[in-house]
Interface confidence: medium
């Protein structure tokens, strides 16, 4: 009696199952008097000797490439051996690499968590994922795993993390890069500082007083509101960041507390109040303003 080993499929792709069947063309293999054993190179596979002429391998990998055969043993201990069958496990090269962000859109608040998710549409086996920062490619991290996606996490985003990023996937056939993804770090405004600028050391009535408000940190555009006591004087926008000014033609009623507020949609901050007082110097005929 002759024994044959049949692998189905005969050219498996990595990660896919394979069924090995020990065929006995001239005998009933279902007959309980036979025991079967499957081998790869010199090593027995699965449960060892079994009454089943089939062995199911759940997932084949590149390193499972090798020479396979089976043996059948009768009750009388006579062992039949099949010829060796070469099974080559096929690896699919990585293709269509993409980089996505969590949160989506690549906009993240300073201090929040950013995840860069590298994915491949195709590829089998151990895939090495590498993340790079900037078009020149500062290598941030690499991970090797048997999956089509991998993640790189920045737990607390800083302003310096605002950059272009890309990832590369490789499983032995050459690296495949993703496109560039731009990360924008959104920074809430810091507490603004209000400065008063007069044309001379002691401003007089009808002088123009400049109220200058500036938040030293914060993503543009920033909208500044100016207040006298709790009355809104007006607003100014700083589309590219920096400060903004509001001009006031002084009258005696302009004594009191001034403040400003900065708002960039990520939160509002109000400055400390600055007090203006009109003083009448002894022997002087005009009123003067001090702060």
């Amino acid at each position: 009696a002759e024994l044959f080993l049949i692998a189905s499929p005969s050219h498996p792709t990595e990660g896919s199952p394979v069924t090995l069947t020990c065929k006995m063309p001239f005998l009933q293999s279902s007959d309980a008097q036979f025991q079967f054993c499957f081998f790869r190179d010199t090593r027995a596979l699965g449960p060892g000797w079994s009454s089943s002429p089939k062995l199911q391998i759940a997932a084949m990998w590149k390193e499972d490439t090798g020479s396979y055969w089976c043996e059948a043993q009768t009750m009388a201990s006579k062992v039949l051996r099949s010829r060796r069958s070469q099974i080559n496990v096929h690896r699919v090269p990585v293709a269509d690499v993409s980089l996505e962000t969590q949160p989506p859109g690549g906009q993240v608040m300073e201090g929040d968590r950013l995840v860069l998710i590298c994915s491949v549409a195709m590829g089998t086996g151990d895939i090495t994922f590498l993340w790079y920062k900037g078009a020149v490619g500062l290598n941030l991290q690499s991970k090797t795993q048997r999956s089509l996606t991998a993640e790189y996490e920045i737990p607390s985003v800083r302003e310096s993390d605002a950059e272009q990023y890309y990832c590369v996937a490789e499983n032995g056939y050459g690296p495949s890069p993703s496109g560039l993804v731009s990360i924008t770090v959104r920074i809430p405004v810091s507490r603004p500082i209000l400065m008063l600028r007069a044309p001379r050391a002691q401003a007089a009535v009808e002088d123009v007083l400049e109220l200058h408000c500036e938040a030293l940190r914060g993503s543009p555009p920033i909208l500044y509101w100016f207040y006298h006591e709790d009355i809104t004087l007006g607003s100014r926008s700083a589309p590219s960041g920096g400060g903004a000014s509001f001009n006031l033609s002084l009258t005696e009623e302009h004594s009191g507390n001034y403040s400003c507020e900065a708002n960039n949609g990520l939160g509002a901050q109000r400055s400390e109040a600055v007090t203006l007082n009109f003083t009448v110097p002894t022997g002087a005929r005009s009123n003067h303003l001090t702060s």
């Epitope: 096929h90 690499s142 490789e170 032995g172 050459g174």
Partner: antibody, heavy 117, light 112 residues
Amino acid sequence: QVQLVQSGAELVKPGASVKVSCKASGYTFTRYWMHWVKQAPGQGLEWIGRIDPNSGGSKYNEKFKSKATLTVDKSTSTAYMELSSLRSEDTAVYYCTRVNSGAMDYWGQGTLVTVSS
Amino acid sequence: DIVMTQSPDSLAVSLGERATINCKSSQSLLYSSNQKNYLAWYQQKPGQPPKLLIYWASTRESGVPDRFSGSGSGTDFTLTISSLQAEDVAVYYCQQYSNYPTFGQGTKVEIK
């Protein structure tokens, strides 16, 4: 431009070892797997093994498993192949080669290793 | 191992004529999952390392003259030099990378 520059020719005695180097430049070293190929005088090409410079993981042709050891030094973008217990049949030109799109797209100039007493 | 067999072992062709080299693999190099043939062709001149000409059986490497073309699928492949030039005198190798790489024995191309 991409360059793989190998160390010079070696004359070694039987039983000795030799370490061939392959310095890569012009590309990101850790991104491309490096393979090594043997060419005996007047003969064809024979694959020895490969190494992933990023992880240091290597795979060998069964025939060269006890003959060759592949390593890398990421800091200098250099791949190494050490050949041990040398015999006359190890006399050959040894090439390092980078793999891209499955194929070997850039090759070193080759290192001739001559084993002779 | 996958065995690669080239034919002929050597070939003499007149300048400007077509040269054809065949390569046969012991098992299919075409995979339905991505419809790619895992085969490359190389040119090697004396004293030089091999040079990649074709990959994925028919994709020409950048900088390679268009007189070089690759064709075939499954187990049978062909490298064609449409009009042989003096600088094409070399040994040509096919190589599979479906599994751990193996090369054909080489075909020497000379001028008749």
